[in-house]
Interface confidence: medium
């Protein structure tokens, strides 16, 4: 279905951009508030979207030091932008069995960003394999 596949592509491009933004932020890790943030790891299958929302809700902040503050704030804002939803995302929203954000181990910004990237990669790979098998549900 044309419009569905177009939506899927849009979703993939946004997810792909998020990986680049995380990579960019990692270069400014010393300019981030060194606060410990919930950082999901080894996320249970079907809880990826729940974990993704935990990363988005986390209070990642610029330390307001120097010239990088504006670009860091812009990128954090972009990280929080909601990607186009997929069937899987809609389905997972209704699951009540996923861990709460507070239950995940808290990590400093560097590890937080590494784990976020890892989850994004997992979600992209799942998405690609689901498309290969003719499904738009994961």
């Amino acid at each position: 279905h044309k419009s569905s596949s177009q939506g899927q592509d849009r979703h993939m491009i946004r997810m792909r951009q998020l990986i680049d933004i995380v990579d960019q932020l990692k270069n400014y890790v010393n300019d981030l508030v060194p606060e410990f943030l919930p950082a999901p790891e080894d996320v249970e299958t079907n809880c990826e979207w729940s974990a993704f929302s935990c990363f988005q809700k986390a209070q990642l902040k610029s330390a307001n030091t120097g010239n990088n503050e504006r670009i860091i704030n812009v990128s954090i804002k972009k990280l929080k932008r909601k990607p186009p939803s997929t069937n899987a995302g809609r389905r997972q929203k209704h699951r009540l069995t996923c861990p709460s954000c507070d239950s995940y181990e808290k990590k400093p910004p560097k590890e937080f960003l590494e784990r976020f990237k890892s989850l994004l990669q997992k979600m992209i790979h799942q998405h690609l394999s689901s498309r290969t098998h003719g499904s738009e549900d994961s």
Epitope: K2, S3, S5, Q6, D9, R10, M12, I13, R16, Q17, L18, I19, D20, I21, D23, Q24, K26, N27, I71, V74, S75, K78, L79, R81, K117, Q121, I124
Partner: antibody
Framework: EVQLVESGGGLVKPGGSLRLSCAAS????????MNWVRQAPGKGLEWVSS????????HYADSVKGRFTISRDNAKNSLYLQMNSLRAEDTAVYYC?????????????WGQGTTVTVSS | AIQLTQSPSSLSASVGDRVTITCRAS??????LAWYQQKPGKAPKILIH???SLESGVPSRFSGSGSGTDFTLTISSLQPEDFATYYC?????????FGQGTKLEIK
């Protein structure tokens, strides 16, 4: 200064191969998605391929799929395009292009281009 | 693939004129569109990203608007250095595609 410099273009016979390189400087190369865009003589722009910052996600135009391979070496600040089974219609100026960062849509840094001519 | 149709294909105008170039997408592309300027023998240069955001260093006489399927690039008062070819490009889905270009010539 933010800069992209392409090399590797030249004259090749149909069915032959070429490897284009792009040297990046003046920015954190490993943070950006990169693209190849081409322009045939007297024609418009055609997107060829893209690769994400960590090489996790790659796409090709249908016209080059199965023949061209994009890759990057972040340690060397370099982008590559391996072109095999070249055809006359691949004759073009090939641009190495940085995709605009921080989640925005656009290609903000372009190299000067390298010319590929496929002819017998 | 999403097709982008630019109009007009060519345009003659004078210094000081207000010029509008349109780009129509075959499907909804949200605001995932950029505009470029290219002069003969040179690489393209980005003018507008995200449909309406002016790229840093680009003169304010350039502006972009639109969302969905219809987009416009406007030059409020043409300068001699603006005579060039202009392209739109979509980033909504693969393959990324460009419009066929609009050549802006001196009248």
């Amino acid at each position: 200064e933010v800069q992209l410099v392409e090399s590797g273009g030249g004259l090749v016979k149909p069915g032959g191969s070429l490897r284009l390189s792009c040297a990046a400087s003046g920015f954190i190369f490993s943070s950006y998605s990169m693209n190849w865009v081409r322009q045939a003589p007297g024609k418009g722009l055609e997107w060829v391929s893209s690769i994400t910052s960590g090489s996790y996600y790659i796409h090709y135009a249908d016209s080059v799929k199965g023949r061209f391979t994009i890759s990057r070496d972040n340690a060397k600040n370099s982008l590559y395009l391996q072109m095999n089974s070249l055809r006359a219609e691949d004759t073009a100026v090939y641009y190495c292009v940085r995709e605009r960062g921080w989640g925005y849509y656009g290609m903000d840094v372009w190299g000067q281009g390298t010319t590929v001519t496929v002819s017998s | 693939a999403i097709q982008l149709t630019q109009s007009p294909s060519s345009l003659s105008a004078s210094v000081g004129d207000r010029v509008t170039i349109t780009c129509r997408a075959s499907q909804d592309i949200d605001s995932a569109l950029a505009w470029y300027q290219q002069k003969p023998g040179k690489a393209p240069k980005i003018l507008i990203h995200d449909a309406s955001s002016l790229e840093s260093g680009v003169p304010s006489r350039f502006s972009g608007s639109g969302s969905g399927t219809d987009f416009t690039l406007t030059i409020s008062s043409l300068q001699p250095e603006d005579f060039a070819t202009y392209y739109c490009q979509q980033f909504n889905s693969y393959p990324y595609t460009f419009g066929q270009g609009t050549k802006l010539e001196i009248k």
